[in-house]
Interface confidence: medium
C-alpha cells in the first residue's frame, strides 16, 4: 500500500435544502484505471460510512441508487454531493481515495471537509 | 459475492468478428460498472471498454469504432462485439465487475486472431 495525497475543502455549508457539495481531489502517482471513492463521516469521534462509489477512469462516478451522494468525475478530481443532510448530520465527512488498479495500490486520505447543517425554520402560520 | 462467466472467444480470422459474453451471478445488485479487460500473450493487462449502470461507455483508443460494449440488466451480461478483428488483438479477455463492495474478475476467455 502507498500513500497518496488527497485534498478537499475545509469547510461547506449545506444548503436549506439539506444538499452539501464539494470537490475531493487526488494527487494520482500512476495511471489508474479503477478509481474507489469513499466519504466517511467522524462526529463524537466515531467514524461512519456515508457512501462508496468505484468508476472507472474516462467513466462517470455512479454511486448505488438508494445512495444518498451523488457525484461525477474529471481527472482527478471527484465533485461530491451529500443529499438529505439535517442539522444532526453535522460533522466532519473525509474523502477517501483509492486506486485500485492496475497494481500498486495507493490509498489516500484527505483532512475532511466540516458540513454544516441548519434546519430551515419552519414557516409561520398566515392569516391570508 | 458476484461471479462472472464469459464465453464466445475462439479462433478468427483478420477482419473477422466475435461477439464476448460475461454472465453475472450472485450480488448484482451491488455491481455499477463492468468492463473487459484483456491480457496479450507477455504483455499485462489493458483496460479494453467500460460501461456504467446508467450506460455510459468508454474504450481504449486501439479499439474504438471497431468493438462495441453493451449491457443487458435484464439479462445479467455484459457483452463485447468485436468486429476488424487485428492479429494484436489476439489475447485473453477478462470480464470485471465494479461496485460499492464489489470487484470481480471473470476467468478469461482465449481470442486468437490468426489466418
Known amino acids: 500500500c502507498k500513500a497518496m495525497h488527497v485534498a478537499q475543502p475545509a469547510v461547506v455549508l449545506a444548503s436549506s435544502r439539506g444538499i452539501a457539495s464539494f470537490v475531493c481531489e487526488y494527487a494520482s502517482p500512476g495511471k489508474a484505471t479503477e478509481v474507489r471513492v469513499t466519504v466517511l463521516r467522524q462526529a463524537d469521534s466515531q467514524v461512519t460510512e456515508v457512501c462508496a462509489a468505484t468508476y472507472m477512469m474516462g467513466n462517470e462516478l455512479t454511486f448505488l441508487d438508494d445512495s444518498i451522494c451523488t457525484g461525477t468525475s474529471s481527472g482527478n478530481q471527484v465533485n461530491l454531493t451529500i443529499q438529505g443532510l439535517r442539522a444532526m448530520d453535522t460533522g466532519l465527512y473525509i474523502c477517501k481515495v483509492e486506486l485500485m488498479y492496475p497494481p500498486p495500490y495507493y490509498l489516500g486520505i484527505g483532512n475532511g471537509t466540516q458540513i454544516y447543517v441548519i434546519d430551515p425554520e419552519p414557516c409561520p402560520d398566515s392569516d391570508f | 459475492e458476484v461471479q462472472l462467466l464469459e464465453s464466445g472467444g475462439g479462433l478468427v480470422q483478420p477482419g473477422g468478428s466475435l461477439r464476448l459474453s460475461c454472465a453475472a451471478s450472485?450480488?448484482?445488485?451491488?455491481?455499477?460498472?463492468m468492463a473487459w479487460y484483456r491480457q496479450a500473450p507477455g504483455k499485462g493487462l489493458e483496460l479494453v471498454a467500460g460501461?456504467?449502470?446508467?450506460?455510459?461507455?468508454n474504450y481504449v483508443d486501439s479499439v474504438k469504432g471497431r468493438f462495441t460494449i453493451s449491457r443487458d440488466n435484464s439479462k445479467n451480461t455484459l457483452y463485447l462485439q468485436m468486429n476488424s478483428l487485428r492479429a494484436e488483438d489476439t489475447a485473453v479477455y477478462y470480464c470485471?465487475?465494479?461496485?460499492?463492495?464489489?470487484?470481480?474478475w471473470g476467468q478469461g476467455t482465449l481470442v486468437t486472431v490468426s489466418s
Open positions: 460501461v456504467n449502470s446508467r450506460g455510459t461507455t
Open positions: 450472485g450480488s448484482i445488485f451491488s455491481i455499477n460498472h
Open positions: 470485471r465487475a465494479l461496485g460499492g463492495a464489489v470487484a470481480a
